[in-house]
């Protein structure tokens, strides 16, 4: 019973985590304009992995995709890759874990097969979570570096009269979503691995019982099941969350256009 609960909980936690990873990857607010110690601007800038957006005081929000692939920073490409790998692994892990759930009966699937599938999905969830955490951390590190660099050159004077204020960026909501989601996926994966141990049938040291019948001596010894790992690796990426991070005023809809001051 405890094994089933651990496995089920691990699945649910991983499902929430992967949904969060997908959400974070789609969100536009990976980095947001730093408003602290900055002149109050009538525009607010924020950036995602796929596009950058500007929200004006007027409520109008304009987003522009990064239509270049080669012109983008290598770090951004690396973060994108890590997040996508995390999503793909997580999606495969979810698919595998569905069939591995003890509460779901699929034909005459043996417990050892379910144990192996649970372990496989657990490992996939762990790697998926680590990918997400790594991706978000790399991006955060990039932000911190750029933040202090732009702080050092905050004001670039032009003849002492004209000043150009550099826009500094700080952590956006997507980073926190990503960290939490990655952590949940990781925890879910660990729970699946723990559940796997409980699912695997143990070698029981029963004494061999001899049955004597009409001169024939046949010994029946309880043996281990043959571990079957022949489950299909269905890589169909099932989207759990398709929301992206639509800021309240990205599309000029009312009344949410001005849900800020």
């Amino acid at each position: 019973m405890a094994v089933t609960a651990c496995q089920g909980l691990g699945f649910v936690v991983s499902l929430i985590g992967i949904a969060g990873i997908i959400a974070a990857t789609c969100m536009d607010q990976w980095s947001t304009q730093d408003l602290y110690n900055n002149p109050v601007t009538a525009v607010f800038n924020y950036q995602g992995l796929w596009r950058s957006c500007v929200r004006e005081s007027s409520g109008f929000t304009e987003c522009r995709g990064y239509f270049t692939l080669l012109g983008l920073p290598a770090m951004l490409q690396a973060v994108r890759a890590l997040m996508i790998v995390g999503i793909v692994l997580g999606a495969i892990g979810l698919l595998v874990s569905i069939f591995a759930l003890k509460c779901i009966r699929i034909g005459s699937m043996e417990d050892s097969a379910k144990a192996n599938m649970t372990l496989t999905s657990g490992i996939m969830f762990i790697v998926s979570g680590l990918c997400a955490i790594a991706g978000v951390s790399v991006f955060a590190n990039m932000l911190v570096t750029n933040f202090w660099m732009s702080t050092a050159n905050m004001y670039t004077g032009m003849g002492g009269m004209v000043q150009t204020v550099q826009t500094r960026y700080t952590f956006g909501a997507a980073l926190f979503v990503g960290w939490v989601a990655g952590g949940l996926t990781l925890i879910g994966g660990v729970m699946m691995c723990i559940a796997c141990r409980g699912l695997a049938p143990e070698e029981t040291n029963y004494k061999a019982v001899s049955y004597h019948a009409s001169g024939h001596s046949v010994a029946y010894k309880p043996g281990g099941f043959k571990a079957s790992t022949g489950f299909g690796s269905n890589t169909k990426n099932k989207k759990i969350y398709d929301g992206g991070a639509r800021t309240e005023d990205e599309v000029q809809s009312y009344p949410s256009k001005h849900d800020y001051v």
Epitope: Q33, P39, V40, T41, A42, V43, N45, Q47, S52, C53, V54, E56, S57, S58, G59, F60, E62, R64, V162, Q163, T164, V165, T167, Q252, Y254, P255, S256, K257, H258, D259, Y260, V261
Partner: antibody
Framework: EVQLQQSGPELVKPGASVKMSCKSS????????MHWVKQKPGQGLEWIGY????????KYSEKFKGKATLTSDKSSSTAYMELSSLTSDDSAVYYC???????????WGQGTSVTVSS | DIVMTQSPSSLTVTAGEKVTMRCRST????????????LTWYQQKPGQPPKLLIY???TRESGVPDRFTGSGSGTDFTLTISSVQAEDLAVYYC?????????FGVGTKLERK
Amino acid sequence: EVQLQQSGPELVKPGASVKMSCKSSGYTFTGFLMHWVKQKPGQGLEWIGYINPYNDGTKYSEKFKGKATLTSDKSSSTAYMELSSLTSDDSAVYYCGRLDYGNAMDYWGQGTSVTVSS
Amino acid sequence: DIVMTQSPSSLTVTAGEKVTMRCRSTQSLFNSGNQRNYLTWYQQKPGQPPKLLIYWASTRESGVPDRFTGSGSGTDFTLTISSVQAEDLAVYYCQNAYYYPLTFGVGTKLERK
């Protein structure tokens, strides 16, 4: 058609207060910030502040903090500006303007003339 | 606060003439996020409220004749009227639309010669 209709001219005594209105029509009132601008006779334009009619959030120019108070009434699609402790320096035409693309005021009221005189 | 400096303060023109007025800000009004300059131009005739001409430094408001052209980037901006008409005689204001408080230039007055 978008229209901003401001209240009529005011003649007030020094030290008194005045409250002027700006009634909106032809658009969703809560969807746009309403800005207020001061213009002294024969002079330039001076930004006072804005109100967000959706949540009544306000932002003021430092110069007008304590002088101007911006409010709005969703039910009548009207923005208000109250000026307190009036002096001769407050004699001016006050405009309301709707903020749109590019943080530009695309529609303006006809202006409310305030004369402070004893 | 951002200071907007307009020059010249007045211009004497004849109909059909090409007119250029300048506006300079003490800080850049360019936003790298959307590659736009947050400078606005208004026209004000006596006894009337200001009328929006150009926003984002170069985008003409709908209904504004195409003889009005806005240009410039960063801190230096220009409003050009390719062929001045009698109805263009007014005061032209530039406005910082990037930083609060929003600030206006003192204006350029267009007068008949």
